[in-house]
Each structure stands twice: as C-alpha cells, then as structure tokens.
Amino acid sequence: EPPTACREKQYLINSQCCSLCQPGQKLVSDCTEFTETECLPCGESEFLDTWNRETHCHQHKYCDPNLGLRVQQKGTSETDTICTCEEGWHCTSEACESCVLHRSCSPGFGVKQIATGVSDTICEPCPVGFFSNVSSAFEKCHPWTSCETKDLVVQQAGTNKTDVVCGPQDRLR
C-alpha cells in the first residue's frame, strides 16, 4: 500500500517517499522505485538554507553600496549574504535593504544610546545640572561646571544648552 506520509527530510511524490535535498543543494530529479533523489550543489552566489525540493537556488542578496550597504557576512551555499550599513548609517528595516544616516542629538539633548548598524541614535533631554551645546551622534550631556570647587560663584545660570558661567567671589552683592 502506498504511503500517505513520509519521514522527516523526505517528501511524497508519485505515491513514494523521496529524500529532500540537503541545504546548499537543489533538486535535479525526483527519486523513483530504482533511483535516489538527484541533487546538485548551488552555484556561485547562490544558496538554499533548508532541506528542500527546490529546482532553483536563491540568489545571494546584493549589498548595494549606492544604498549605503556593505557585506557584513559573505553568503555560502547554505546561507544568504548578510548586509549592514556603512559607518555612520543604520538599517531602515530588519531585512536591512537600505540605510539612513544616524540621527544627531540637538543642543539640549545628549546621546543616551549610540547608534549601531541596525539601530538609530537614541537621544534624551539634558536634565538640570547638565548641558549639551552641540549637535552630535556621540556626545552625552555634560555636567555644569562646579564653580564652588574652583572657589568661584555662579555668575550666570546654566541651561540645558549652556554651561554655567563662573566668576570671582568678590562680586557678591
């Protein structure tokens, strides 16, 4: 009696169970009563990453430098190429099909988390006692200068964008 289901890594065809092709290989011909499944390795720049019965291998992803992409990991016959972004850029999606420039944190904001190839810069407002006077993708908020430790007094209050201005003690009013 012909089988209705096959074991793992097999497929049912013409009422018989044939072996699937292993990762890195494509199907040339199905098995018969007398012959095994015939498989062939994927060509250069091609891959198949599962046990399969595909008759064509997939093309490796192309990391297009015009989109800011570069190869992070070269593909093999069993794996696709992994793209990442050039320095200073990050992927627009999980699939990393294109890149955008890292965001800079405006004055008054500091970098909470530096961008990576897959995530943008995370900025946060500088709290009272800290400031940032630059637009930067790397700089954290800086603490205000402590005038007291320099035996000076605050002449002008700091803001989230400016440091305090210290001055001599003798200007006390």
């Epitope: 909470k112 709290p127 005038c147 007094v153 605050v154 006390l172």
Partner: antibody, heavy 122, light 113 residues
C-alpha cells in the same frame, strides 16, 4: 538649623506692586538657590523661579517673566520677590524655599518658609 | 513643560490601612547618565507649608518615617503609606526637577475616615 522667615500678609489694590521678603538663617545664604512658589486654592503649587543670592543669577518660569522679579541682599541674608501690575489672579500664598542644590544634580525644595498671603482686591 | 498628573485627587482611608497614590509625568524623569529619577514628594498638612518627604523618587529625607515609601521610574511613580496614622492627614504633591520650569502635580488629598 536652616530657617526661612517670610514677611507678613499683604492686602493690595489691582495694578499695584508688592515686594515679599524671605530672611534666611542657619546656612551660607549666598551659595544656595532660593526658589519661589505660588499656591492658589484649587491650583496646587506653581514654581515661579529661583535666584542664586551670591551672584544674582536667576531662572524664571516663562509664565511669570515680567510679573515676578527676584533680588537678594547678601548683607542681610534676605531674598525678595516683587510682583507687579497685580490682578485678582495674583491673590495667593507665596512661598520661598531653599533648594538642595549641587552642580551635577537636580534641585528639590528642601526647606520652606511659612508663606506670605497676598490678597488683591479693589 | 513637563506635565505632572496625580491620582486620585482625594481618598479617605481608615487608620492602619495601606494607601498608594500615583504620579505620572509627560516625559521620562530618568536620566541615563546617572540612572536617577528627578522626582520629589512633598507633604502639606492643613495650614502649613509643604515639607519635603522624598527625593530621587525613592530616597527618604531624614526624619521621614519608613512607613512612607517612594517608588517608580521613568514616567510612573507612587508614594505608599504602609499603615496610615491620623497625622498623615495632608495633601501630597509630586514635583519634577528634571527640567525648567520645575512642575508639580495637582496633589492627592488624604483624608482619614
């Protein structure tokens, strides 16, 4: 110990100005920010601004800029807040408070005066 | 400006009960540079000035009983009184000191049944 003594209640006419005082004792007056806070029934607490007596440096809540003016006299350890062009909206209790202030941290209000009631009425 | 919202606006509890009041901010009060939450709690008893209870969201001022506990991080904070006493009758305010202008919540009035 730290104490802040405020001037007494004031009954003022609309359009007038009033100057409230806050005398500090028990610490080095010039080096800590003095905060000013407004409290109206049903309006909770509102921060007006702050002054550092040693230099006269100030920060104002934009809402009160032009309404409140802060000054300080280090010889008498007294901070002042002047409120101008008074209207009924300015009727409130006004508190001075000393912030707990260090340069790499934020500022909470550690010590409070007893409050000054300002009533604006024709 | 950072908006501070407190709830409930009032509540009545019996002596000995546990009570929790909340405070929410319109933006995070947690600064990653020092991992501190820029939030304070104050108690104002009838006819008195406000009194500082807690700073940095959870640090009790000296002399504040340990039945008062501040907790929370980011935008959500709470003040818990584990066993209410008659002397706790007051309005409780939260305040952010992350950025100018400093702002207060509208207060929670604690009444004793």
């Amino acid at each position: 110990q730290v104490q802040l003594q405020q001037s007494g209640a004031e009954l003022m006419k609309p359009g007038a100005s009033v100057k409230i005082s806050c005398k500090a004792t028990g610490y080095t007056f010039s080096t800590y920010w003095i905060e000013w806070v407004k409290q109206r029934p049903g309006h909770g607490l509102e921060w007006i601004g702050e002054i550092l007596p040693g230099s006269g440096s100030t920060n104002y809540n934009e809402k009160f800029r032009g309404k409140a003016t802060f000054t300080a006299d280090t010889s008498s350890n007294t901070a002042y807040m002047q409120l101008s062009s008074l209207t009924s909206e300015d009727s409130a209790v006004y508190y001075c408070a000393r912030s707990y202030y260090t340069y790499d941290q934020g500022s909470w209000l550690a010590y409070w005066g007893q409050g000054t009631l300002v009533t604006v009425s024709a | 400006d950072i908006v501070m919202s407190q709830s409930p606006s009032s509540l009545a509890v019996s002596v000995g009960e546990k009570v929790t009041m909340t405070c929410k901010s319109s933006q995070s009060l947690l600064y990653s540079g020092n991992q501190k939450n820029y939030l304070a709690w104050y108690q104002q008893k009838p006819g008195q000035s406000p009194k500082l209870l807690i700073n940095w969201a959870s640090t009790r001022e000296s002399g504040v009983p340990d039945r008062l506990t501040g907790s929370g991080s980011g935008t959500d904070f709470s003040l818990t009184i584990s066993s209410v006493k008659a002397e706790d009758l007051a309005v409780y305010y939260c305040q952010q000191y992350y950025s100018y202008p400093y702002t207060f919540g509208g207060g929670t009035k604690l009444e004793i049944k």
